[in-house]
């Protein structure tokens, strides 16, 4: 019968040694056997568990010249870069037979200098304002005690004696570095360094100080900036067209905005080439040598309506007997507003001007009362919109109707509002 | 008697491939770990990677990890260095060596005890 | 990567000569650390391994010891052929990483 298949006699002639080092550790654990006839095939356990998918090799050396003589087998099994889940009883197992053989265990820890699973980060911070650093180490072996340093400075007598793993700062007025060191029975490991930039607070209480209807004028309070200086604000206005959508909250504008820079103090900034009677959201950020704040919410504003910026286009004028009729259009030139309709101002050669509201039809039809003798008579036309009127349009002279001309189909001004006039 | 020889070297344009073979004898290549080591014309050694030739698997320097592969044939005792997208600061003489496993049920790290005796891979300048 | 820096980089040394290069690892590398010799136009030769372990074959002249981050090579008493340049090489973890090199020429 082959050598090995008593449950007595163990064919391991080589057990496992024990491996303890550092995270990141390259090992190699070896067995040997002595086996009669065909070589098993060596498996290796950690912990009782079979290692599917090891990094081991296999080298068989026969001892005799006939393949039913002994052979030694050795088995190396590789560990490449040892870590926590590495760690445990190894063992090699072969079958033999009807039998399962496995060889004395070798031990594999984990012993080093602490390991860093958390360090603290870089970031940002409004001055004065508290925020959370973390950190976070294991051995073993253990225990692992913390110590933060802040600028290079330990924040507590001894490891272990100050914050552990969150450290909490309740707010900084310059820009500094943490780390954190990680003691144990076998040394001290420092964390990276990270960088605390602090940035001035957001500013407050955004607010509009004055309205033109292609212009306004805002201001804001500036929050604390700790020791650096604010260098300049900036403001962004964006169209709130309605699909648009900003929400308060919401970061970045769904269109390029009109950016402006305030050089500060006084937190003030005017800002012009606006559209009038057009909402706007607008926000304010304020600058360091660190870098800018967040930004504000978005603030709606509004820019008030103004008048017409020009007469109303084309405007003819046509006499015929008692009647005439004037018509008109739409100011080419922006409205700055709502259009709410058209003054019409009619005069003849010394006598009074005479102003009617139209309303918003681009013509009227006159009844002249009396013998219509008056001479020179002139029309002229603005448009108004709620902050007022327009400028008017140059004199039109009232011409006579010649037979042929086209005459539109019109009302005659009968409204309370707009009677017939007469000119004595 | 062990014995590693390198063939397959020469030259090669700039992002060619070239397979380096290491046959070995007087011993089996299923039972250590075969490591690839390069040195550049007056340079030091540098490690290029390692095959478990017994389980395949190849473990890769970073210099080089994607364009190399490294293989091996246990019925031929041969190991293989595959090189793909090569550079001309890939130039150097290529030395496949045995990983030497002596040491007891256990070891920490390793050494290479048999080398073979190089294979130059150069570019056209 | 741990880096290994060797010194000096370069000695000139008479035969009988004591001679002693010495090798640096950034981090400990606990005692994974082999020396090699390698003559122009030849394959590098095992020289020690596990940092004062002699291998089979290598006179007794030579010698490797330390752990942790230093580590040196001692050629006893320098022999004609034993000019040559030395590497040391750590394997702590992995890639393994080698020094630069020290040249050992005759004065």
């Known amino acids: 019968a082959p050598r090995g298949t008593q449950a007595e006699e163990s064919p391991f002639v080589g057990n496992p040694g024990n491996i303890t080092g550092a995270r990141g550790l390259t090992g190699t654990l070896r067995c040997q056997l002595q086996v009669q006839g065909e070589p098993p095939e060596v498996h290796w356990l950690r912990d009782g568990q079979i290692l599917e998918l090891a990094d081991s090799t296999q080298t068989q050396v026969p001892l005799g010249e006939d393949e039913q003589d002994d052979w030694i087998v050795v088995s190396q099994l590789r560990i490449t870069s040892l870590q926590l889940s590495d760690t445990g009883q190894y063992q090699c197992l072969v079958f033999l037979g009807h039998q399962t053989f496995v060889s004395q265990p070798g031990y594999v820890g984990l012993e080093g200098l602490p390991y860093f699973l958390e360090e603290p980060e870089d970031r940002t911070v409004a001055a004065n304002t508290p925020f959370n650093l973390s950190c976070q180490a294991q051995g073993p072996p253990e225990p692992v005690d913390l110590l933060w340093l802040q600028d290079a400075v330990p924040l507590a007598t001894a490891p272990g004696h100050g914050p552990q793993r969150s450290l909490h700062v309740p707010g900084l007025n310059k820009t500094s570095s943490f780390s954190c060191e990680a003691h144990n029975a076998k040394g001290v490991t420092t964390s990276r360094t990270a960088t605390i930039t602090v940035l001035p607070q957001q500013p407050r209480n955004l607010h509009l100080v004055s309205r033109q209807p292609t212009e306004l004028e805002v201001a804001w309070t500036p929050g604390l900036s700790g020791i650096y200086p604010l260098t300049h604000c900036t403001l962004q206005a964006v169209l709130s067209d309605d699909g648009m959508g900003i929400q308060a909250g919401e970061p970045d504008p769904p269109e390029e905005p009109l950016t402006s820079q305030a050089s500060v103090p006084p937190h003030q900034l005017r800002l012009g080439s606006l559209h009038p009677h057009t909402p706007y959201h607008i926000r304010v950020a304020c600058t360091s040598s660190q870098g800018p704040s967040s930004w504000t919410h978005w603030l709606p504003v509004e820019t008030p309506e103004g008048v017409p910026l020009g007469p109303p286009e084309n405007i003819s004028a046509t006499r015929n007997g008692s009647q005439a009729f004037v018509h008109w259009q739409e100011p080419r030139a922006p409205l700055q507003g709502t259009l709410l309709g058209y003054r019409l101002a009619y005069q003849g050669q010394d006598t009074p001007e005479v102003l009617m509201d139209i309303g918003l039809r681009q013509e009227v039809t006159l009844e002249l009362q009396g013998d219509g003798s008056v001479s020179n008579l002139t029309v002229c036309v603005a448009a108004y919109t709620a902050a007022g009127d327009g400028p008017w349009s140059l004199p039109v002279p009232l011409e006579a109707w010649r037979p042929g001309q086209a005459q539109p189909v019109h009302q005659l001004v009968k409204e309370p509002s707009t009677p017939a006039f007469s000119w004595p | 008697e062990v014995q590693l020889v390198e063939s397959g070297g020469g030259l090669v344009q700039p992002g060619g491939s070239l397979r380096l073979s290491c046959a070995a004898s007087?011993?089996?290549?299923?039972?250590?770990?075969i490591h690839w080591v390069r040195q550049a014309p007056g340079k030091g050694l540098e490690w290029v990677g390692w095959?478990?030739?017994?389980?395949?698997?190849?473990y890769y320097a970073d210099s080089v990890k994607g364009r190399f592969t490294i293989s091996a044939d246990t019925s031929k005792n041969t190991a293989y260095l595959q090189m793909n997208s090569l550079r001309a600061e890939d130039t150097a003489v290529y030395y496949c060596a045995r990983e030497y496993s002596g040491w007891g049920g256990s070891s920490v790290g390793y050494a290479m005890d048999y080398w073979g005796q190089g294979t130059l891979v150069h570019h056209h300048h | 990567d741990i880096q290994m820096t060797q010194s000096p980089s370069s000695l000139s040394a008479s035969v009988g000569d004591r001679v002693t290069i010495t090798c640096r690892a950034s981090?400990?590398?606990?005692?994974?650390v082999a020396w090699y010799q390698q003559k122009p136009g030849k394959a590098p030769k095992l020289l020690i391994y596990?940092?004062?372990f002699l291998y089979s074959g290598v006179p007794s002249r030579f010698s490797g010891s330390g752990s942790g981050t230093d580590f040196t090579l001692t050629i006893s008493s320098l022999q004609p052929e034993d000019f040559a340049t030395y590497y040391c090489q750590q394997s702590y973890t992995t890639p393994p990483t080698f020094g630069q090199g020290t040249k050992v020429e005759i004065k």
């Open positions: 596990s940092a004062s």
């Open positions: 981090q400990d590398v606990s005692t994974a």
């Open positions: 095959i478990n030739p017994y389980r395949g698997y190849a």
């Open positions: 007087g011993f089996s290549l299923s039972g250590s770990w």
